[in-house]
């Protein structure tokens, strides 16, 4: 189960001066993600930093049991045993992929 959250922040400005930049980037980037630069290892506290080609921003693929923009929160999602015809009910959890704006 993957959730994506987007947070809008000030201080960022789009680089739209040169349209050819965007075209070149899209042409050259066929894969969805490339690794962040190595010095960004600290961007995700409990997870892997990825650079999303489509989103044009860093994102975190959180380790199991963690969530949040920087995988900084413990994920307490659990499997509940529910009486009745439905034996198991899934509540949240899973692999979280958070994008940073």
């Amino acid at each position: 189960n993957t959730t994506t959250t987007t947070k809008s922040e000030d201080g960022h400005y789009a680089r739209t001066d040169y349209a050819e930049n965007a075209n070149k980037l899209e042409e050259s980037a066929r894969e969805h993600h490339i690794p962040c630069p190595e010095h960004y290892n600290g961007f995700c506290m409990h997870g892997k930093c990825e650079h999303s080609i489509n989103m044009q921003e860093p994102s975190c693929r959180c380790d199991a049991g963690y969530t949040g923009q920087h995988c900084e929160k413990k994920d307490y999602s659990v499997l509940y045993v529910v009486p009745g015809p439905v034996r198991f009910q899934y509540v949240g959890g899973g692999s979280h992929h958070h994008h940073h704006h």
């Epitope: 201080g11 190595e38 010095h39 600290g42 961007f43 860093p58």
Partner: antibody, heavy 124, light 108 residues
Framework: QVQLVQSGAEVKKPGSSVKVSCKAS????????ISWVRQAPGQGLEWMGG????????NYAQKFQGRVTITADESTSTAYMELSSLRSEDTAVYYC?????????????????WGQGTLVTVSS | EIVLTQSPGTLSLSPGERATLSCRAS???????LAWYQQKPGQAPRLLIY???YRATGIPDRFSGSGSGTDFTLTISRLEPEDFAVYYC?????????FGQGTKVEIK
């Protein structure tokens, strides 16, 4: 507009320490990597290390490992670089720099914003 | 660490001429993580090109970057008086981040 403002020039004795500050304004501070780069007189640029304030994790160039400490205070949007056991070869202009990734159609992790530089002179 | 070697060390040209600056890496560098900076005396460096070929905001189109792998080039198509400065390449995909030693573009 993002601005990085550094502390003033310092004159230090060999063997002592110096702590240079870099205050960010005009944008989000916590999630950007802040680097420290130095430039000795007439020389090129040398990356010392940096930090992502949100995590507090710093990493350093091996040359400076054990002698440099980079920290950040999210509450004041200020990054610090402390260099110890100073020697004359540490005389340089020290810059803080921030990357400039954006939510635009193209992006960069290169150093888009720079402080004005802080001259540190090490002399007996 | 990745060593970046720039050539030539100094380039003596006249305004209006074309400048070609080279940056060679000791091992392959991702094109996503190669930048060029301009620095004038007494000033902080200024980002010109990132991702090997993308101009930073506000940079005139006479500046262009190209290359891949271990060989990268910064070209200034027609030198203006304000372009005479020192130029540095930088790789920022691998830690430690490294810079080339610089190329000085001076007036002939």
């Amino acid at each position: 507009q993002v601005q990085l403002v550094q502390s003033g020039a310092e004159v230090k004795k060999p063997g002592s320490s110096v702590k240079v500050s870099c205050k960010a304004s005009g944008g989000t501070f916590s999630s950007y990597y802040i680097s420290w780069v130095r430039q000795a007189p007439g020389q090129g640029l040398e990356w010392m290390g940096g930090i992502i304030p949100i995590s507090g994790r710093a990493n350093y160039a091996q040359k400076f490992q054990g002698r440099v400490t980079i920290t950040a205070d999210e509450s004041t949007s200020t990054a610090y670089m402390e260099l110890s056991s100073l020697r004359s070869e540490d005389t340089a202009v020290y810059y803080c720099a921030r990357d400039g990734y954006s939510s635009g159609r193209s992006t960069t992790y290169a150093f888009d914003y720079w402080g004005q530089g802080t001259l540190v002179t090490v002399s007996s | 660490e990745i060593v970046l070697t720039q050539s030539p060390g100094t380039l003596s040209l006249s305004p209006g001429e074309r400048a070609t600056l080279s940056c060679r890496a000791s091992q392959s560098v991702s094109t996503y993580y190669l930048a060029w900076y301009q620095q004038k005396p007494g000033q902080a460096p200024r980002l010109l090109i990132y991702g090997a070929s993308y101009r930073a905001t506000g940079i005139p189109d006479r500046f262009s970057g190209s290359g891949s792998g271990t060989d990268f080039t910064l070209t200034i198509s027609r030198l203006e008086p304000e372009d005479f400065a020192v130029y540095y390449c930088q790789q920022y995909g691998h830690s430690p981040i490294t810079f080339g030693q610089g190329t000085k573009v001076e007036i002939k």
